[in-house]
Amino acid sequence: RAPRCRELPAQKWWHTGALYRIGDLQAFQGHGAGNLAGLKGRLDYLSSLKVKGLVLGPIHKNQKDDVAQTDLLQIDPNFGSKEDFDSLLQSAKKKSIRVILDLTPNYRGENSWFSTQVDTVATKVKDALEFWLQAGVDGFQVRDIENLKDASSFLAEWQNITKGFSEDRLLIAGTNSSDLQQILSLLESNKDLLLTSSYLSDSGSTGEHTKSLVTQYLNATGNRWCSWSLSQARLLTSFLPAQLLRLYQLMLFTLPGTPVFSYGDEIGLDAAALPGQPMEAPVMLWDESSFPDIPGAVSANMTVKGQSEDPGSLLSLFRRLSDQRSKERSLLHGDFHAFSAGPGLFSYIRHWDQNERFLVVLNFGDVGLSAGLQASDLPASASLPAKADLLLSTQPGREEGSPLELERLKLEPHEGLLLRFPYAA
């Protein structure tokens, strides 16, 4: 008799793929544009990335450091009208893209939560949650919560409002903290909260450190749903050298949880390469004309247009990983087991019941390494086969679909491999 199938877990929409942050509408659209109507025209691009949610804004009225002139119910006219927003919501819904609204109050000011009048601000947030839920948004984000006094209790209250409206609504909190204990204390009091932090930005870009951070986090959070990013708002290039971007994309898309990216992460957008552009929100490079300030500063391979035409580009890799992440059971909600593969390597298996299984091997090192996969570290339910098919490599040149002998696996410097193999009874 065939073994009984394992019962599928309840999956919310944010469990099924990546979230895409557009914190600065104007930088995202460029060319002096930057409003909600223009963003609507970019939804097809977001669809092509296979992302499940758009984290938008803040876009509310906020006069720098002025509580009285901060209105979380009003859209800043520079970004458009409530009608533009409703239209964006409708279009996004048609394309199965959820919209999460950032309500960080004083986003133009020094302290995101104002230094005084905490209760006034908290009341404003509460009212805003109810207002925007009625308007049809799918969730909210609040950032810099380390600046919010009694953050845990406020988050619990806001979570109740959000979930009270519908279990299908999401609350994301962001913190600059990278301290695991602080992160855990925020998570403890808020069951379904999705938390973005700087936890992984401390990885020092080494395999053994990254492995220990990831496994510590997963062990500490138990079976609760995680999110994975390197910060609450910034680009991957703020933390990583270019040669590690592909590796981190592969890792973020294949860890158990929701990957969260900022606009531009998919093309390796780097403020440092664009003189005069702000680090936190450089202009999005749609094509070579997106940054006219310095002629020749932008080459085709830095842009969406150029990378879309190149199957070996970072953008093409992002799209492939996003697609896999959203359709494979083992990547959607599979179990995770990390195991030893040798110095500098981080390797793990994702598996769900009798579905196709995935092996990820990441070489964080600046040297080619032979992987000594220690299958003895794995439970019987997650054993390794002798061979696995190469689904993709972060480096060009490997023959995809070909079976690789796991005993003889050798990785190039900074190479990551995603391999697949069938369930064997």
Partner: antibody
């Protein structure tokens, strides 16, 4: 400043084992890998392997897989190379070298070397 | 394994002369991911341990005199000493740091006339 201290010499009998030490100072021991290199008199350099002090994972050159064992003691910031079943072929100078793996992957600091003589 | 071949095995030069030595690898050391060549040069003076001079084929280690110049790409590399000094008497080894096992060339012995 970065220093890797190794004892000057070891005299050992054929068939015996020897454990060489390399004490690191002047940097964060767990942030860099430790590499070991063999040099026979008047000869070139041969890479033995390296170890990551943060989690003690080691990788060996195939040639030294059955000969060498790399370990670390984080509390004393010391790396060790154990050589077993010694023969005259193992008489050489053994260097430890800091392996700057994340940034540029080369051996940027070397110990003074321990001269191992295998003789009855 | 990547085989490293150095030439000449020895050379004798006078102070002030320009010295070039060659190193060839059995496969390319160019990493397409970052366009860097993973080749290092080490100097070993008599009775001393080796010292890193150059990595990534042409990046001089801090504190190394600028008369030492590394060049080359793919499989062919050169170390040049533009104006040799008496203290440059040493063995010079190239090493690939592209892939394990890390491998060294047999060395070039530089003697001063």
């Amino acid at each position: 400043q970065v220093q890797l201290q190794q004892p000057g010499a070891e005299l050992v009998r054929p068939g015996a084992s020897v454990k060489l030490s390399c004490k690191a100072s002047g940097y964060t021991f767990t942030s860099y890998w430790m590499s070991w290199v063999k040099q026979r008199p008047g000869q070139g350099l041969e890479w033995i392997g390296f170890i990551t002090p943060s989690d003690s994972e080691a990788l060996y050159s195939q040639m030294f897989k059955d000969k060498a064992t790399l370990t670390v003691d984080k509390s004393s910031s010391t790396a060790h190379l154990q050589l077993s079943s010694l023969t005259s072929e193992d008489s050489a100078v053994y260097y430890c070298a800091r392996w700057s793996y994340g940034n540029f992957a080369a051996m940027d600091y070397w110990g003074q070397g321990t001269s191992v003589t295998v003789s009855s | 394994d990547i085989v490293m071949t150095q030439s000449p095995s020895s050379l004798a030069m006078s102070v002030g002369q320009k010295v070039t030595m060659s190193c060839k690898s059995s496969q390319s050391l160019l990493n397409s991911n970052n366009q860097k060549n993973y080749l290092a040069w080490y100097q070993q003076k008599p009775g001393q341990s080796p010292k890193l001079l150059v990595y990534f084929s042409s990046t001089r280690e801090s504190g190394v005199p600028d008369r030492f110049i590394g060049s080359g790409s793919g499989t062919d590399f050169t170390l040049t000493i533009t104006s040799v000094q008496a203290e440059d008497l040493a063995d010079y080894f190239c090493q690939q740091h592209y892939s394990t096992p890390l491998t060294f060339g047999a060395g070039t012995k530089l003697e001063i006339k």
